[in-house]
Interface confidence: medium
Amino acid sequence: SGTTNTVAAYNLTWKSTNFKTILEWEPKPINQVYTVQISTKSGDWKSKCFYTADTECDLTDEIVKDVKQTYLARVFSYPAGHVESTGSTEEPPYENSPEFTPYLETNLGQPTIQSFEQVGTKVNVTVQDEWTLVRRNDTFLSLRDVFGKDLIYTLYYWKSSSSGKKTAKTNTNEFLIDVDKGENYCFSVQAVIPSRRTANRKSTDSPVECMGHEKGESRETGHHHHHH
């Protein structure tokens, strides 16, 4: 039988990619459930994930209201089977999260090469612009919309027949590179925010895409499109 003893949550951790933001914590509950609150430094607390037995709470809807704000969350522990009573004045145990600033701290998701097109000795490589849950005027914004010129992409490319890699950079979503005639190339891209000085400065590399593979030969003046 469960008791009414509750323990404070611990190991509160923000997991955020392309602004999709989840707060995680320990422990898996035994005799308790959790409620999460979130606020900005100057704002009021807002409760989310009421009396949940989960050890995570999706706070995306709150942080996308202003991704440049700094947020703090806290996790309250209540006895399992708890029904909020108006007479209770005792504050349940809780733990604060680290501060979280989405614009500075959200991880960059793995990018995808949308297409590449070869014309002569030039190849145009296009990176798919990822949609986020950040809104402006009821419209969802893309990663590029949110970060603007703060976001660049690095292209790694190499001849299929060799391992020597070259790089190119762009602050749009397109690259135009020179290639050797008659050679097939492979491509991979990485999203980067150069102004960041932390481990989340770069995304993981995109899946490698190669000319002349799987979806038809890439003719010298033809097109080779990848749709994901």
């Epitope: 008791t3 989840i22 995680e24």
Partner: antibody
Framework: QVQLQESGPGLVKPSQTLSLTCTVS?????????WSWIRQHPGKGLEWIGE???????RYNPSLKSRVTISVDTSKNQFSLKLSSVTAADTAVYYC??????????????????WGKGTTVTVSS | EIVLTQSPGTLSLSPGERATLSCRAS???????LAWYQQKPGQAPRLLIY???SRATGIPDRFSGSGSGTDFTLTISRLEPEDFAVYYC?????????FGGGTKVEIK
């Protein structure tokens, strides 16, 4: 009745990435359980690799964390394991399992109540 | 990491005898997180006991679990021929979740 089935290559070359998928049938992967990977080296005991919740949040064994990725595809009712830079020491039977939170009389209990049959993975060149 | 130490490593008994298996944790484990499993050669583990003392669905009542804190016990009151197998305890509360090294119950 929920059943789990592991699938993936039985032979992986050293330094490559081991990839396995667990297909959940007879129930939804989004039904509030955690989904784990466990392995068993030949003639040895059981080692927990990590788990994932249907929403995608993960917990990993710190001894393997740098090499492990567990992901979930709710549309296919599957979850997957990737273990990079494998060596012969990763040769084992790999099991997927359901880690169930069970609420009873004011408290929660946790246990792995449904297991796949296991798939043998050999790391060799 | 919570280390679970099972003893004895091997238990040689005859059908009809009583088997007592021990699982000792390196630090206190809530009983809500403690489970016992049975594994036969070539098969996946099978849940026997959860919450340290609750029998899983379909498990005969000759299997019972007890204990709290750092000391847990699985008891098989009268061994049947199908009970000869390896038994593992497990804690699923603190990452990394860990299993004991196993106790092999073999026919004497």
């Amino acid at each position: 009745q929920v059943q789990l089935q592991e699938s993936g290559p039985g032979l992986v070359k050293p330094s490559q990435t081991l990839s396995l998928t667990c297909t959940v049938s007879g129930g939804s992967i989004s039904s509030g359980q955690y989904w784990s990977w466990i392995r068993q080296h030949p003639g040895k005991g059981l080692e927990w690799i990590g788990e994932i919740y249907y929403s995608g949040s993960t917990r990993y064994n710190p001894s393997l964390k740098s090499r492990v990725t567990i992901s979930v595809d709710t549309s296919k009712n599957q979850f997957s394991l990737k273990l990079s830079s494998v060596t012969a020491a990763d040769t084992a039977v790999y099991y997927c399992a359901r880690d169930t939170p069970y609420y009873y009389d004011g408290g929660y209990y946790y246990y792995m109540d449904v297991w796949g049959k296991g798939t043998t993975v050999t790391v060799s060149s | 990491e919570i280390v679970l130490t099972q003893s004895p490593g091997t238990l040689s008994l005859s059908p009809g005898e009583r088997a007592t298996l021990s699982c000792r944790a390196s630090q206190s484990v809530s009983s809500s997180y403690l489970a016992w499993y049975q594994q036969k050669p070539g098969q996946a583990p099978r849940l026997l006991i959860y919450g340290a003392s609750s029998r899983a669905t379909g498990i005969p009542d000759r299997f019972s679990g007890s204990g709290s804190g750092t000391d847990f016990t699985l008891t098989i009151s009268r061994l049947e021929p199908e009970d000869f197998a390896v038994y593992y305890c497990q804690q699923v509360g603190v990452v990394p979740y860990t299993f004991g090294g196993g106790t092999k119950v073999e026919i004497k």
